[in-house]
Amino acid sequence: EPPTACREKQYLINSQCCSLCQPGQKLVSDCTEFTETECLPCGESEFLDTWNRETHCHQHKYCDPNLGLRVQQKGTSETDTICTCEEGWHCTSEACESCVLHRSCSPGFGVKQIATGVSDTICEPCPVGFFSNVSSAFEKCHPWTSCETKDLVVQQAGTNKTDVVCGPQDRLR
């Protein structure tokens, strides 16, 4: 695309190129042949994050505690507030408009990736040689106990939900 009649950080209005307002400011009046563009800073709890010709600033996002949200980063005149979720909860979308409780991994499954404020717990089935006997959002699959290292023998085989049961070796008579 060839360049347009007005340069970057300018806009075309009534046959002239006016300067855009910088981030954090809104347009009060367009430039004329004799005057510059007039801009005003955004008010408290407002922002504009681009060079713009907006006549109203945007309201900062509200992190509603009733939806499990809290402020991760306070907004400025140039940036929106960033919300995240309370401990034990995660965002339901990229915009983080509400939160849901982290899921727990059922017995037979372990935590592959612990949940964050923006992503849920990722579970994986415990492979052979590993087990999980609890429902947890933190516990990984644990390896079965090694009876041999304790000079014991397996009395009951392990499963993905239970550890092996070790017992003493039969004594030769």
Epitope: P2, P3, T4, A5, C6, R7, L12, I13, N14, S15, Q16, C17, D30, T32, E33
Partner: antibody, heavy 116, light 107 residues
Framework: QVQLVQSGAEVKKPGASVKVSCKAS????????IEWVRQAPGQGLEWIGV????????NYNEKFKGRATLTADKSISTAYMELSRLRSDDTAVYFC?????????WGQGTLVTVSS | DIQMTQSPSSLSASVGDRVTITCRAS??????LNWYQQKPGKAVKLLIS???RLHSGVPSRFSGSGSGTDYTLTISSLQPEDFATYFC?????????FGQGTKVEIK
């Protein structure tokens, strides 16, 4: 005083191109946009496009995109409007105008007649 | 594109009359409305820019008003040299568009 002097009348055949010039004087040529407008016989005004003579940036009316080409030569304070693939309904008076707040100053117009 | 509807398309008036021409835009044009005068064989003249700003050298009998979509050009006391065609034009959104014109004739 500000003056925009356009080239003389042209008669063209359908399918041909025409290039109209607009020589500016009395102000800083690169400080203002140059607008192009046409007026068919007995009709209203129709905007063609605008050029920034300072660096050649342009905006066109979608209707003329691909057929109209706006250029400017800073060294001689002259803007040009070329219209290609002419049709009989392109018969009109073509105007250049200096921007500012609105089309502040106008050329006298150039009659382009398209006829076989 | 923004449509500009000008009325009346023509009017007959006498010297000294007060004349009003209106222009309606198909959407809000934020006061970016200009008025022009065209006489046969003469260069088009800008009369008023941005709704109400009189262009340099234009007599004060010409005035403009309006907002949003509705705008008015008023000639307070028509003079012989004012018999001409008048156009409105919006400069808010590309492509710039014009009204169809109002021809002011001698009664």
């Amino acid at each position: 005083q500000v003056q925009l002097v356009q080239s003389g009348a042209e008669v063209k055949k359908p399918g041909a191109s025409v290039k109209v010039s607009c020589k500016a004087s009395g102000y800083g040529f690169t400080n203002y946009l140059i607008e192009w407008v046409r007026q068919a016989p007995g009709q209203g005004l129709e905007w063609i496009g605008v050029i920034n003579p300072g660096y050649g940036g342009v905006n066109y009316n979608e209707k003329f995109k691909g057929r109209a080409t706006l250029t400017a030569d800073k060294s001689i304070s002259t803007a040009y409007m070329e219209l290609s693939r002419l049709r009989s309904d392109d018969t009109a008076v073509y105007f250049c105008a200096r921007g500012g707040s609105g089309f502040a100053f106008w050329g006298q117009g150039t009659l382009v007649t398209v006829s076989s | 594109d923004i449509q500009m509807t000008q009325s009346p398309s023509s009017l007959s008036a006498s010297v000294g009359d007060r004349v009003t021409i209106t222009c309606r835009a198909s959407q809000d044009i934020s006061n970016h409305l200009n008025w022009y005068q065209q006489k046969p064989g003469k260069a088009v003249k800008l009369l008023i820019s941005s709704t109400s700003r009189l262009h340099s050298g234009v007599p004060s009998r010409f005035s403009g008003s309006g907002s949003g979509t509705d705008y008015t050009l008023t000639i307070s006391s028509l003079q012989p040299e004012d018999f001409a065609t008048y156009f409105c034009q919006q400069g808010n959104t590309l492509p710039w568009t014009f009204g169809q014109g109002t021809k002011v004739e001698i009664k």
